[in-house]
């Protein structure tokens, strides 16, 4: 039961994380205008990975896409790449993990196959989360560098009477969404990897030993039960005889609306 719970929770956490990574990637507020020097601005600027926007006091908002590819900073391109890689890996991970879920039956898939798929999706989630965290952190570092550079520029070259206010940018909401989402995806991936350990059957073959009891003899054959490192009695056991009793996971062995082929 604990394995199913760990796997299911890992899947849900990763799903939320990847949704967050997608949301962060699409958001326009990666960097927002710093209002420290002008808290009563009537024009508010903010920028995303794909476009920059201006919101006026009037309520009018105008966004312009970055229609150039070569003219963009290499760091921005790198952040875009990291976020897209994170999304792609996460999406593939989700697809794989759906089929790996213990509560979903696909034909006669072995536990070992499910364990492998769970591990694969877990690793994908971990890499996806790391990509998102790395992407957001690179962008944040870029912002901090630019912030202090523009601050230095603000106090130089003001010899004339006319002041030119340079727009400085600070962390936008998307950065926090990205960090949290990346973290969730990472946690979800770790949970999937932990669940994999519970799913993986360890083939331990014991040598046949004959016990001679007085009256009659019973031979215990090897491989009767598969040894398991699972949490409790949740792992599926091979039956020695086909009795009336079934394990919890074997109750629905016939096709149903819950099965995925």
């Amino acid at each position: 039961m604990a394995v199913t719970a760990c796997q299911g929770l890992g899947f849900v956490v990763s799903l939320i994380g990847i949704a967050g990574i997608i949301a962060a990637t699409c958001m326009d507020q990666w960097s927002t205008q710093d209002l420290y020097n002008n808290p009563v601005t009537a024009v508010f600027n903010y920028q995303g990975l794909w476009r920059s926007c201006v919101r006026e006091s009037s309520g009018f908002t105008e966004c312009r896409g970055y229609f150039t590819l070569l003219g963009l900073p290499a760091m921005l391109q790198a952040v875009r790449a990291l976020m897209i890689v994170g999304i792609v890996l996460g999406a593939i991970g989700l697809l794989v993990s759906i089929f790996a879920l213990k509560c979903i039956r696909i034909g006669s898939m072995e536990d070992s196959a499910k364990a492998n798929m769970t591990l694969t999706s877990g690793i994908m989630f971990i890499v996806s989360g790391l990509c998102a965290i790395a992407g957001v952190s690179v962008f944040a570092n870029m912002l901090v560098t630019n912030f202090w550079m523009s601050t230095a520029n603000m106090y130089t070259g003001m010899g004339g009477m006319v002041q030119t206010v340079q727009t400085r940018y600070t962390f936008g909401a998307a950065l926090f969404v990205g960090w949290v989402a990346g973290g969730l995806t990472l946690i979800g991936g770790v949970m999937m990897c932990i669940a994999c350990r519970g799913l993986a059957p360890e083939e331990t073959n014991y040598k046949a030993v004959s016990y001679h009891a007085s009256g009659h003899s019973v031979a215990y054959k090897p491989g009767g039960f598969k040894a398991s490192t699972g949490f409790g009695s949740n792992t599926k056991n091979k039956k020695i005889y086909d009795g009336g009793a079934r394990t919890e996971d074997e109750v629905q062995s016939y096709p149903s609306k819950h099965d995925y082929v």
């Epitope: 600027n45 201006v54 006091s57 009037s58 312009r64 030119t164 727009t167």
Partner: antibody, heavy 118, light 113 residues
Amino acid sequence: EVQLLESGGGLVQPGGSLRLSCAASGFTFSSYTMSWVRQAPGKGLEWVATIIIGGSYTYYADSVKGRFTISRDNSKNTLYLQMNSLRAEDTAVYYCTRLVKGNAMDYWGQGTLVTVSS
Amino acid sequence: DIVMTQSPDSLAVSLGERATINCKSSQSLLNSGNQKNYLSWYQQKPGQPPKLLFYWASTRESGVPDRFSGSGSGTDFTLTISSLQAEDVAVYYCQNDYSYPFTFGQGTKLEIK
């Protein structure tokens, strides 16, 4: 047709209070940022206050800060300017205006005259 | 606060002639985010409320005759009437729309010579 109609002006003694109203029609009032601008007799234009679309943000000229309060009632399509502790220098024609692209004021009311005198 | 200074204070131009009004701001009104200048021009005729002529320094408001043009960037702006008509007699104001408090120029009175 867009219309802005101010009311509530009149003669008031220094230190007194007055509440100006601006009835808006011909447009979706709740979707626009609104402002008050005043013009003293024979003088230029002076921005007084602005209230953002939702009403959550308000901005005031330094000369009226702490004395004037701008508010809006979107259900009644009405903009208000509550003026307290009035001074002689507040004597002016008060215009209600609508903000559009570029934070420009595209529509102005006919104005209401406020006279502060003893 | 951004200070707006208009020049000249008054201007007399013959009918059909070009009229030029200047406006200077103490701070740049150019927004780096969209490369637009947050300055508007208004025309006020005697006994009437002001009328918007231009926003974003050079974008003409609908219904404004094309003899009017707005130009400039940063801190220096110009309103030009290419061929003055009798109905253009009015006081013209420039306004900072970039940051609060919104400030107006002192106005330029345009008359016919």
